[in-house]
Interface confidence: medium
């Protein structure tokens, strides 16, 4: 063996943001010829020795961080990056507004504000774009999201979520969409790969390989992916927190 077994990838299809009661599939992908996969939910004793986990209806208890690895012979691979599986629709949707308004001149400034009546300390802003279900979207954990020196690339549809740092994988429903229009430019907006399309039940037979049920905190199967900055913290954008522990 010339090097360590490369880490597998772990994906959530069609998205890692899953509305309650909607389906999602977790897929661990390693090189060809893998002897055994191990897919586990972190900070719990739940695991399965399969590459694919089909969740027919998202539950609060299934939200959290997942990781997988694989075995070839007696060797185990390095673990995959952690996957943050988020249940959305747990709380009422926040409101998203643009100050001074949703129409802004190219080169100007605009601030998107996500507001909620509840005591949430975390907010996530997404820009809708071309489907990119395997890529973590840009995320800022702040209530106000200033966009300085606006360009055509900022045009598009935005949504925000609110949640609590005490339960970082249980999110609100998405806000109503906000359409940001950049005027004074003829350049076609670039579509930034951000929020995946809303999950829908479009699983083929090949995708729905495993159905999950929990028995004694072990995945039993039937064949059939911190900084969590509060609104008062840094103005700089922070990526999604890979806190793979129960906060």
């Amino acid at each position: 063996q010339s090097g360590p077994l490369p880490k597998p990838s772990l994906q959530a299809l069609p998205s890692s943001l899953v509305p309650l009661e909607k389906p999602v599939t977790l897929r661990c992908q390693g090189p060809p010829g893998v002897d055994l996969y191990r897919l586990e939910k972190l900070s719990s004793s739940r695991y399965q020795d399969q590459a694919v986990l089909f969740i027919p209806a998202m539950k609060r208890s299934l939200a959290g961080r997942y990781r997988c690895s694989y075995q070839n012979g007696s060797l185990w691979s390095l673990p995959s990056d952690q996957l943050e599986l988020v249940a959305t629709g747990v709380f009422a949707k926040p409101s998203l507004s643009a100050q001074p308004g949703p129409a802004v001149s190219s080169g100007g400034d605009v601030t998107l504000q996500c507001q909620t009546r509840y005591g949430f300390d975390q907010f996530a802003l997404y820009k809708e774009g071309d489907p990119a279900p395997y890529k973590n979207p840009e995320r800022w954990y702040r209530a106000s999201f200033p966009i300085i020196t606006v360009t055509a690339a900022h045009s598009g549809t935005y949504r925000c979520y609110s949640f609590s740092s005490r339960d970082p994988y249980l999110w609100s429903a998405p806000s109503d969409p906000l359409e940001l229009v950049v005027t004074g430019t003829s350049v076609t907006p670039s579509r930034l790969p951000t929020e995946p399309p809303s999950p829908v039940a479009e699983f083929s037979e090949a995708t729905a390989e495993l159905t999950v049920s929990f028995t004694n905190e072990v995945f039993t199967t039937e064949t059939s992916r911190s900084i969590t900055a509060s609104p008062k913290e840094s103005d700089s954008p922070a990526g999604p927190a890979r806190q793979y522990y129960t906060k």
Partner: antibody, heavy 114, light 106 residues
Framework: QVQLKESGPGLVAPSQSLSITCTVS????????VNWVRQPPGKGLEWLGM???????DYNSTLKSRLSISKDNSKSQVFLKMNSLQTDDTARYYC????????WGQGTSVTVSS | DIQMTQSPSSLSASLGGKVTITCKAS??????IAWYQHKPGKGPSLLIH???TLQPGIPSRFSGSGSGRDYSFSISNLEPEDIATYYC????????FGGGTKLEIK
């Protein structure tokens, strides 16, 4: 060939900030995370934090309020910033690749002294 | 946070002999433990990950075992170049090193 190399100021005054750069080669920062670890003189290794391939971060909970890790993928550089340094922050600082840290730099020595 | 208690803090053994180091986690770490060799003036070297998987190029006289909260690391047929400090690392929940074990040869 995977390589990591740390560069730092060497000497920092108490209450000031520390900035260290880790320059990597042989792998892409978009596909691998980078950790920061330190070793005070005569003591053991202490994990400081990590930046993942997608730019997200994790920090040692006891140091989280003073730490910031960022990166520039195009320059293959990862940056550690630590605020409000005290003499017990004197240590050798290492960067290391991903989990569970399969490649390490040689480290850079940082002394906090007036 | 998970704590890792490593013992002994130092040990001395004869060439050709065998030594065992243990690490106990404050909670179940599901085999996510790695072992490192650290020599002065160098960065640490990964020897074993996921409890027992040897890194490429690491001789088989290095071994690891364990599950749950209790893990061990052994070196058999000790050689002079094994003089170093050895650390365990849990990476189940953030990352935590053990306190280290300084190995000396009699």
């Amino acid at each position: 060939q995977v390589q990591l190399k740390e560069s730092g100021p060497g000497l920092v005054a108490p209450s000031q900030s520390l900035s260290i750069t880790c320059t990597v080669s042989g792998f892409s920062l978009t596909g691998y995370g980078v950790n920061w670890v330190r070793q005070p003189p005569g003591k053991g290794l202490e994990w400081l934090g990590m930046i993942w391939g997608d730019g997200s971060t994790d920090y040692n909970s006891t140091l989280k309020s003073r730490l910031s890790i960022s990166k520039d993928n195009s320059k293959s550089q990862v940056f550690l910033k630590m605020n409000s340094l005290q003499t017990d922050d004197t240590a050798r600082y290492y960067c290391a690749r991903d989990l569970p840290m399969d490649y390490w730099g040689q480290g850079t020595s940082v002394t906090v002294s007036s | 946070d998970i704590q890792m208690t490593q013992s002994p803090s130092s040990l001395s053994a004869s060439l050709g002999g065998k030594v065992t180091i243990t690490c106990k986690a404050s909670q179940d770490i599901n085999k996510y433990i790695a072992w490192y060799q650290h020599k002065p003036g160098k960065g640490p070297s990964l020897l074993i990950h996921y409890t027992s998987t040897l890194q490429p190029g690491i001789p088989s006289r290095f071994s690891g075992s364990g599950s749950g909260r209790d893990y061990s690391f052994s070196i058999s047929n000790l050689e002079p170049e094994d003089i170093a400090t050895y650390y365990c690392l849990q990476y189940a929940n953030l990352l935590t090193f053990g306190g280290g074990t300084k190995l000396e040869i009699k």
